[in-house]
């Protein structure tokens, strides 16, 4: 476990001309926030996927009024860090979005207005613990600058947080193998020994003898890098060979949370509600004392003054859970199905919805060749919610309303000559060439070296190609 | 037309458990929250928890940890309210009230209440 | 937790009045506030949500309005089943908190 936290320094305009009009103005004041979304790995992914890292958002900054005929400065900015905890390792590497959004103080009742100033993205490798990377990107004519670093909660150390730290049994230095857990020193580092050839880099493990696979990477040792782009399913187990995530059991089933913890599915993984005594992402770690400092996010500890009498997290407001580890906000209910993301406007919520999906919350599932028509004989093929159309011969575009030019592709190998036909195309293939694409050789006794000519045609002649 | 039945009056003896119901109609159960309020004799409203019942889950107000719980039932459009250990405090009529989920609208519909008596 | 300050919290006044109830929350809640309505005995009634729309129903002779942490509960002409308690209640932010209430007696 550990915390995610961002520190933004400017938000202004970006160097060079174009400057851009400030957000606010007399008559309409406002004042900007931020929101940080995070997501493991260092995949291309839509704005619209779970920020399955976890997301937070800033405090509003100060009421900021544009000064008449002066370029827009750099506008004043929310006090404090925004922070995002996750509960598993840090994986490394991962995707992050910043957006800037700007609240409107009019007069209207029913809540300010809100509307999205800049949108950034970047993919980044980071190691817990490090120090603050800095960054600059830039979104139209604006500027962001900001920092940002990942530190693990204790007892957790390490560039992934998976090692443990615990007190020293011997006053003097920690048992053999075992280091001090800087910056804790008269703490050691937790014997931790994963299962033999376990992948430095992209595996990790939080008990003796596993070996559990970073984001993007699967097989027994996690050295066999995913694809998925020919499976069924976007849910394990991992399949060690083709290192395909096939279609399998929920990460719930068999219920891997430990000590009578309670098992719920999340869009990556699973979380495990672990009951008092026990936590982890297993709810593996016990003997749990207050000296151990079990409770999160400035949660009060009460009882459990020995390892066999449960301790008690009293919670700050805006943190619950037994061990006060989940942020509580109006978007912690999950108004949002299917993957859709929330948004607390202020004086609502809405759902940002995953391809393929509508509705308010998310909840209607798109029947993508609904009311859809491909034209000139095309069959329309259900895909995630964009619909596509499979087009007859000679015709093609998103509704096969396009007469396609079949030769467009250059698809006559060697120099052969495409001619459009009806049916699809034909190609007339140079001296020394055969096949429907002129893709085989002739060797000079007339033999090919591949499947010969069907009868009735010579090597040099035009064959269609079906 | 929008309805929420309540279970009826219980009187429990300290110690004991009980579980009040709250069946809905004539909505969709699982777009709106269904919100538990607490009003004791000659007390305020006091805001027990939330539960999604499209999903289960749930925030509870941190003075009503441990001993309450919600649930819901989506089959039967109802959801529920359990409160173990009973305390003499814990005398007072409980409401169900539904909240649109995506926080559009307030608490319209409200349960008829019911009351639990805890006395020995 | 946000606390609701409301007041009067008890008036009595003649059919026909127009009374005001207000509110204030210890921090400002974005209009995300309602106003209920509870009659003797009986159970509560959504009247006002977002600080100043009515509940479907609702006589127009009730209103909502302010905004930031200030809000109150107008209603004109008052009518003989307009006798009743009022509250508000906030949502912004968890957990909820509603105000102690206001009781409207006939003079």
């Known amino acids: 476990a550990g915390v995610f936290e961002l520190q933004i320094h400017s938000f202004g305009p970006g160097p060079g001309p174009g400057a851009p009009r400030s957000p606010c103005s007399a008559r309409l004041p406002c004042r900007l926030f931020f929101r940080v979304c995070l997501k493991p790995g260092l995949s291309e992914e839509a704005a619209e996927s779970p920020c399955a890292l976890g997301a937070a958002l800033s405090a509003r900054g100060p009421v900021y009024t544009e000064q008449p005929g002066a370029p827009a400065p750099d506008l004043p900015l929310p006090d404090g860090l925004l922070q995002v905890p996750f509960r598993d390792a840090w994986p490394g590497t991962f995707s992050f979005i910043i957006e800037t959004w700007r609240e409107e103080l009019g007069d209207q009742i029913g809540g300010p207005a809100w509307s999205l100033l800049a949108r950034v993205a970047g993919r980044r490798r980071l190691a817990a613990g490090g120090p603050w990377a800095r960054d600059i990107q830039r979104a139209g004519a604006w500027e962001l600058r900001f920092s940002y670093r990942a530190r693990c909660e204790p007892p957790a150390v390490g560039t992934a947080c998976t090692r443990l730290c615990r007190p020293r049994s011997a006053p003097s230095r920690c048992g053999p193998g075992l280091r001090p857990c800087a910056p804790l020193e008269d703490e050691c580092e937790a014997p931790l020994v994963c299962r033999a050839g376990c992948s430095p880099e992209h595996g990790f493990c939080e008990q003796p003898g596993e070996c559990r696979c970073l984001e993007g990477w699967t097989g027994p040792l996690c050295t066999v890098p995913v694809s998925t782009s020919s499976c069924l399913s976007p849910r394990g187990p991992s399949s060690a060979t083709t290192g395909c995530l096939v279609p399998g059991p929920g990460p719930c089933d068999g219920n891997p949370c430990a000590n009578g913890g309670s098992c719920s599915e999340t869009p990556r993984s699973f979380e495990c509600t672990c009951p008092r005594g026990f936590y982890g992402l297993r709810c593996e770690v016990s003997g749990v004392t207050c000296a151990d400092g079990p409770c999160f996010n400035g949660g009060l500890c009460v009882g459990g003054a020995d390892p066999d009498s449960a301790y008690i997290c009293h919670c700050p407001p805006g943190f619950q859970g037994s061990n006060c580890e989940k942020r509580v906000d109006r978007c912690s209910l999950q108004p949002c199905r299917n993957g859709g993301l929330c948004l607390d406007l202020g004086h609502a919520l809405r759902c940002r919805c995953r391809a393929g999906f509508a509705g308010p919350r998310c909840e209607h599932d798109l029947d993508d060749c609904a009311g859809r028509a491909c034209a000139n004989g095309g069959t329309c093929v259900e895909g995630g919610g964009a619909h596509r159309c499979s087009c007859a011969l000679g015709f093609g575009g998103r509704d096969c309303r396009e007469r396609a030019d079949p030769c467009a592709a250059r698809p006559c190998a060697h120099g052969g000559r495409c001619y459009a036909h009806f049916s699809g195309l034909v190609c007339a293939c140079a001296p020394g060439y055969m096949g429907a694409r002129c893709e085989f050789p002739v060797h000079p006794d007339g033999a090919s070296a591949l499947p010969a000519a069907p009868p009735g045609l010579r090597p040099g002649d035009p064959q269609r190609y079906l | 037309e929008v309805q929420l039945v309540q279970s009826g009056s219980e009187l429990k003896k300290p110690g004991a458990s009980v579980k009040v119901s709250c069946k809905a109609s004539?909505?969709?159960?699982?777009?709106?929250?269904m919100n538990w309020v607490k009003q004791a004799p000659g007390q305020g409203l006091e805001w027990m928890g939330i539960?999604?019942?499209?999903?289960?889950?749930?925030i509870y107000n941190h003075k009503f940890k441990g001993r309450f719980v919600l649930s819901v039932d989506k089959s039967s459009n109802t959801a529920y309210l359990q409160i173990s250990s009973l305390k003499a405090e814990d005398t007072a009529v409980y409401y169900c009230?539904?909240?649109?989920?995506?926080?559009?609208?307030?608490?319209?519909?409200w349960g008829q209440g019911t009351t639990v008596t805890v006395s020995s | 937790d946000i606390l609701m300050t409301q007041s009067p919290s008890s008036m009595s006044v003649s059919l026909g009045d127009t009374v005001s109830i207000t509110c204030h929350a210890s921090?400002?809640?974005?209009?995300?506030m309602g106003w209920l309505q509870q009659k003797p005995g009986k159970s509560f009634k959504g009247l006002i949500y977002?600080?100043?729309n009515l509940e479907d129903g609702v006589p127009s002779r009730f209103s909502g309005s302010g905004s930031g942490a200030d809000y109150s509960l107008t209603i004109s002409s008052l009518e003989s089943e307009d006798f009743a308690d009022y509250y508000c209640?906030?949502?912004?932010?968890?957990?909820?908190?509603f105000g102690g209430g206001t009781k409207l007696e006939i003079k």
């Open positions: 009230a539904r909240q649109d989920s995506l926080l559009d609208y307030a608490m319209d519909y």
């Open positions: 004539g909505y969709t159960f699982t777009d709106y929250y």
């Open positions: 539960i999604n019942p499209y999903s289960g889950v749930t």
């Open positions: 921090q400002g809640i974005s209009g995300n």
């Open positions: 977002h600080g100043a």
């Open positions: 209640v906030q949502y912004a932010q968890f957990p909820y908190t």
